[in-house]
């Protein structure tokens, strides 16, 4: 008889629970130990790495990853063609574009090769796991005295993103945020000229298109004022 | 088999407002959008907005942000549209039409509401 | 807002026809362009999405092409129940936007 453990695995929906399904024997064997658990994460829906922690186990293990797509015409079991290894030791496996469905339940199901019956798998809605790229091309328009907007694009649908702008001066200790909806655009509306500002933006696949909670990394900053503003005082786009 | 059924023609008086029902079945309700579009008498196609089922968040046309309301019970796979303060130019046909969210087109939709609005 | 601009507005063909449908977007929308085909009192139907792919149960005599501003349909091969509205609509920003339409008749 298979007994089957729950446990959440940070993925919000109830859906994307981690099963563990392990054989209980007589002693305490191999195949009762838990496999490590799979984190998946979709870059920029361009490729996806699912990765576990190898060195959890006991001894060294090639684990295996399969894969499928749940009540899907995507829902044959797939092998891991693209392992990822950490010290020659299988870490992860990364999958290609057209192997990634968003809104199909994924289900990534792990194995100890030595021992078939140990085994877990997990249901995951990828569109919950999606990380786009960083945001790119910052610009700065002076729109008035004292008003700046700053622009910038990413590598990915608008209306998939939202956005966190921090800013800066050289005076603060700290940095203020804005949250920007898809329309990637942020004006400042009090600039003071004597003081030098820094921006950065990073990006997130929420809410339109999914609920994901982990940002992009930040983008490349960009700075205004005191020293560059007299350069061009109505555009500045070099990156730091 | 994917359906989405609306609820029944509606007549309004001109200020009033409408509530049009989608109901959907055959697949998993929170992996996509549900849009609303409408058709005015020998017009074209018109987007409203749409919202995500995944989540709830909703975006509108600004011609309609004032007045459109989309909703959500997802415990029943249900869409509402509640359009407000109606004129005489807002009689049309009011379709509701699901999308997966990226790149996919408008693939199932509803009949079809007929609202009128005639003092 | 994107501006969808179909031509013609309305085309008279025959059965066997080959017949082609433009649409232009005001601005670059990458491969975000979907075509729908209505007809009279119905609800309209997806025919190819993401510039070029054939939505199921779509014939293969339908076909998409095109990139950035430019866009076409095409029937290979007129069939009698191909004669309908078709519209194009970009799927790229918000808010998502419909060509006017183009009436296929018979001739």
């Known amino acids: 008889l298979n007994t089957t453990i729950l446990t959440p695995n940070g993925n919000e929906d109830t859906t994307a629970d981690f099963f563990l399904t392990t054989m209980p024997t007589d002693s305490l064997s191999v195949s009762t130990l838990p496999l490590p658990e799979v984190q998946c994460f979709v870059f920029n829906v361009e490729y996806m790495n699912c990765t576990w922690n190898s060195s959890s186990e006991p001894q060294p293990t090639n684990l295996t990853l399969h894969y499928w797509y749940k009540n899907s015409d995507n829902d044959k079991v797939q092998k891991c063609s693209h392992y990822l290894f950490s010290e020659e030791i299988t870490s992860g496996c990364q999958l290609q574009k057209k192997e990634i469905h968003l809104y199909q339940t994924f289900v990534v199901q792990l194995q100890d090769p030595r021992e078939p019956r140990r085994q877990a798998t997990q249901m995951l809605k990828l569109q919950n796991l999606v990380i786009p790229w960083a945001p790119e091309n910052l610009t700065l328009h002076k729109l008035s005295e004292s008003q700046l907007e700053l622009n910038w694009n990413n590598r990915f649908l608008n209306h998939c993103l939202e956005h966190l702008v921090q800013y800066r001066t050289d005076w603060d200790h700290s940095w203020t945020e804005q949250s920007v909806d898809y329309r990637h655009k942020f004006s400042l509306p009090s600039v003071d000229g004597q003081k030098r500002y820094t921006f950065r933006v990073r990006s997130r696949f929420n809410p339109l298109c999914g609920s994901a909670q982990h940002w992009s990394e930040w983008s490349h900053p960009i700075h205004w004022g005191s020293n560059t503003s007299k350069e061009n005082p109505f555009l500045f786009a070099l990156e730091a | 088999e994917v359906q989405l059924v609306q609820s029944g023609a509606e007549v309004k008086k001109p200020g009033a407002s409408v509530k049009v029902s989608c109901k959907a079945s055959g697949y998993t309700f929170t992996s996509y959008w549900m849009h609303w579009v409408r058709q005015a008498p020998g017009q074209g196609l018109e987007w409203m907005g749409h919202?995500?089922?995944?989540?709830?968040?909703?975006n509108y046309a600004e011609k309609f942000r004032s007045r459109v309301t989309l909703t959500a019970d997802t415990s029943t796979s249900t869409v509402y549209m509640e359009l407000s303060s109606l004129r005489s130019e807002d009689t049309a046909v009011y379709y509701c039409a699901r999308s997966q969210p990226y790149y996919y087109g408008m693939d199932s939709w509803g009949q079809g509401t007929t609202v009128t609005v005639s003092s | 807002d994107i501006q969808m601009t179909q031509s013609p507005s309305s085309l008279s063909a025959s059965v066997g026809d080959r017949v082609t449908i433009t649409c232009r977007a005001s601005?670059?929308?990458?491969?975000?362009l979907n075509w729908y085909q209505q007809k009279p009192g119905k609800a309209p139907k997806l025919l190819i999405y993401y510039k070029s792919r054939l939505h199921s149960g779509v014939p293969s005599r339908f076909s998409g092409s095109g990139s950035g501003t430019d866009f076409t349909l095409t029937i290979s091969s007129l069939q009698p129940e191909d004669f309908a509205t078709y519209y194009c609509h970009q799927g790229h920003t918000i808010p998502f936007t419909f060509g006017q339409g183009t009436k296929l008749e018979i001739k």
């Open positions: 919202i995500y089922l995944g989540g709830g968040a909703t």
């Open positions: 601005q670059d929308i990458s491969n975000y």
